[in-house]
């Protein structure tokens, strides 16, 4: 005799497979606020969507626990090396977790790059940083993107800088 | 009394889970035709495969609507900066969508890089560009990879430059 | 009359969906042994985990056949160009497959970069290399990460250099 509970769970599994959590958020001019906070994102227009995930002040917020592949790309660019970016200071791009159990953000995936060559140069340069990896997130935990040197992040049309996740 | 329709759907869900759309296409010497078109790909030999996705003239073609993680990596290389690649002109690598309603390609994910340093330099250089993100695709829509400066794409044995997707 | 076997398979499918193979391994000080072997990884502490995959001497080991999205990021850094890294020799970062049928490792995904600019320079530089793509793996096959110039890999707290996979 088949367990109705199991049947319900299977039906639910099919439904949830159809709506497995996923999101893709895109960069906008308001993404980099220059406040030292995380980057902010477009969540609804253009290529952006949220399916089974929430959004709050730059953060993707999980509604169910599980393993998620999280990713972010940022488009970097400038002319020469901006003041304060010494030759030995890289651009740091990272994905960080916020959780109620710890007051400080936890590093998840981080990249460092020296994109602008020699500070003396006045040439225009472009670089791109991609991060992606699988992390475990509890329901209600938040993931944000930070670029310490946010003045170098180039935002245009939502295709150059973005942030997303999906459950695996 | 269990609904046979639901049972069939569950059996189908299991089958389709087993065969969830996925593809990985690899670079070949014919990938870069120098015609201004998208890059072309190997679809069957070596590491390349198509499962629940089609291929047509460089494009991955969806057979079912859904959210897909699409990705591409291109291996770039050269000696100094090729003629026409001014110091402020980057290499642009992008994933683009083709759909019948909008005949001009729509940007999905794009990266810019200044890989070759100073134009005066005659040194050999290598760089790699990776893109990946989740996008929604209707059945029959096409995704292509473009590198505007395609003469810089270095193709060798299908592991350096590639293009793929899977449903999430 | 519904096939019990099918029911069992569906129940199994639901269980396996819950526990679909996935892993994320992180860099540690012992990752780069300088022996010419693959990079070694943390499998349990911090962000690292194994779910339905095994680990052996730097390798992720599959327990079931299927298509896997495999990925790796390595953080590179140095001062100037180290001895032996001629201006035309790139850093090579790759994912390779080991299988009992072939004695030599098979290239899966490979990247080349010239991260350190001119060898004469004594400046500090940082770069990051990301690889990801879908490959088919049989049960018991192994995937490893190699960076030929492993002295350039910078390891710190498991967020800069990592290696993972999940079934698609």
């Amino acid at each position: 005799d088949q367990d109705t509970g199991s049947w319900e769970q299977l039906v639910q599994a099919r439904r949830s497979h159809k709506a497995s959590p996923a999101a893709h958020l895109t960069g906008a001019n308001s993404s980099s606020m220059g406040t030292g906070g995380p980057l902010l994102w477009e969540t609804q227009l253009g290529l952006a969507f949220l399916r089974g995930l929430g959004y709050h002040d730059g953060a993707l917020v999980t509604t169910q626990a599980g393993y998620y592949y999280i990713y972010s790309k940022v488009q970097l660019g400038g002319v020469g090396c901006p003041q304060g970016l010494a030759t030995d200071l890289p651009v740091t791009h990272g994905l960080y977790k916020r959780t109620t159990r710890y007051p400080e953000e936890l590093e998840l995936l981080v990249s460092r790059r020296s994109p602008c060559g020699r500070a003396a140069s006045s040439r225009v340069w472009w670089d791109s940083s991609f991060l992606g990896g699988v992390v475990h997130l509890e329901a209600g935990e938040e993931v944000v993107v930070r670029v310490l040197e946010e003045q170098l992040v180039r935002l245009r049309d939502g295709t150059r800088s973005y942030f997303g996740a999906f459950m695996v | 009394d269990q609904d046979t329709g639901s049972w069939e759907q569950l059996v189908q869900a299991r089958r389709s889970h087993k065969a969830s759309p996925a593809a990985h296409l690899t670079g070949a010497n014919s990938s870069s035709m120098g015609t201004g078109g998208p890059l072309l790909w190997e679809t069957q030999l070596g590491l390349a495969f198509l499962r629940g996705l089609g291929y047509h003239d460089g494009a991955l073609v969806t057979t079912q609507a859904g959210y897909y993680y699409i990705y591409s990596k291109v291996q770039l290389g050269g000696v100094g900066c090729p003629q026409g690649l001014a110091t402020d002109l980057p290499v642009t690598h992008g994933l683009y969508k083709r759909t019948t309603r909008y005949p001009e390609e729509l940007e999905l994910l794009v990266s810019r890089r200044s890989p070759c340093g100073r134009a005066a330099s005659s040194r050999v250089w290598w760089d790699s560009s990776f893109l990946g993100g989740v996008v929604h695709l209707e059945a029959g829509e096409e995704v292509v990879v473009r590198v505007l400066e395609e003469q810089l794409v270095r193709l060798r044995d299908g592991t350096r430059s590639y293009f793929g997707a899977f449903m999430v | 009359d519904q096939d019990t076997g099918s029911w069992e398979q569906l129940v199994q499918a639901r269980r396996s969906h819950k526990a679909s193979p996935a892993a994320h391994l992180t860099g540690a000080n012992s990752s780069s042994m300088g022996t010419g072997g693959p990079l070694l990884w943390e499998t349990q502490l911090g962000l690292a985990f194994l779910r339905g995959l095994g680990y052996h001497d730097g390798a992720l080991v599959t327990t079931q056949a299927g298509y896997y999205y495999i990925y790796s990021k390595v953080q590179l850094g140095g001062v100037g160009c180290p001895q032996g890294l001629a201006t035309d020799l790139p850093v090579t970062h790759g994912l390779y497959k080991r299988t009992t049928r072939y004695p030599e490792e098979l290239e899966l995904l490979v990247s080349r970069r010239s991260p350190c600019g001119r060898a004469a320079s004594s400046r500090v530089w940082w770069d990051s290399s990301f690889l990801g793509g879908v490959v088919h793996l049989e049960a018991g096959e192994e995937v490893v990460v190699r960076v030929l110039e492993e002295q350039l890999v910078r390891l710190r707290d498991g967020t800069r250099s990592y290696f993972g996979a999940f079934m698609v």
Epitope: Q44, L45, G46, R51, D157 | Y67, E104, E138 | -
Partner: antibody, heavy 117, light 110 residues
Amino acid sequence: QVQLVQSGAEVKKPGASVKVSCKASGYTFTSYGISWVRQAPGQGLEWMGWISAHNANTNYAQKLQGRVTMTTDTSTSTAYMELRSLRSDDTAMYYCARLYRNWFDPWGQGTLVTVSS
Amino acid sequence: QSALTQPASVSGSPGQSITISCTGTSSDVGGYNYVSWYQQHPGKAPKLMIYDVSKRPSGVSNRFSGSKSGNTASLTISGLQAEDEADYYCCSYAGSSTLLFGGGTKLTVL
């Protein structure tokens, strides 16, 4: 092909509510937003807001906050726009449109709502 | 956020070219390549003519073209025809899940 078909014209008294429907076909309904735009007689287009069909997130124009509610029924691929506490200046042609990326395409044929005592 | 600024009316003779402007700010028109244009004939629903500043959907005549310079987008109609007489509206993405319409321009074919 992609099509949006709206419900018929309505005549309402001030203070009443109206609910306009918009049935979609020819595409994956849950993968796009539905936007509502109105046009008073002889006036320009006024964006009212939209709803995301896959997660029911809404975004309403400031001036209509508290009076407008947008909903969807994914089982019938239908979007609804309800406007409460109607006033005479709500008399307008109400259009639904699929929100595709950052533009509206296609549009419904329009529903004329007349508010008159 | 206020509406984008369009001229109230423009006119031209058959065969001529006309241009309709749409002026915004660096936070909308100038900040993104997300400007669209709509044509509306009397008593009809609006119709998409241009998206992403300069791209035409299938079925739209190549006599219609779009461009952008700074904070101003433009719709140009060449070889003006009688059936082009209609109202035209621009629309721009303005960040933070916001889209802005222009006030509309009435095109008269003389």
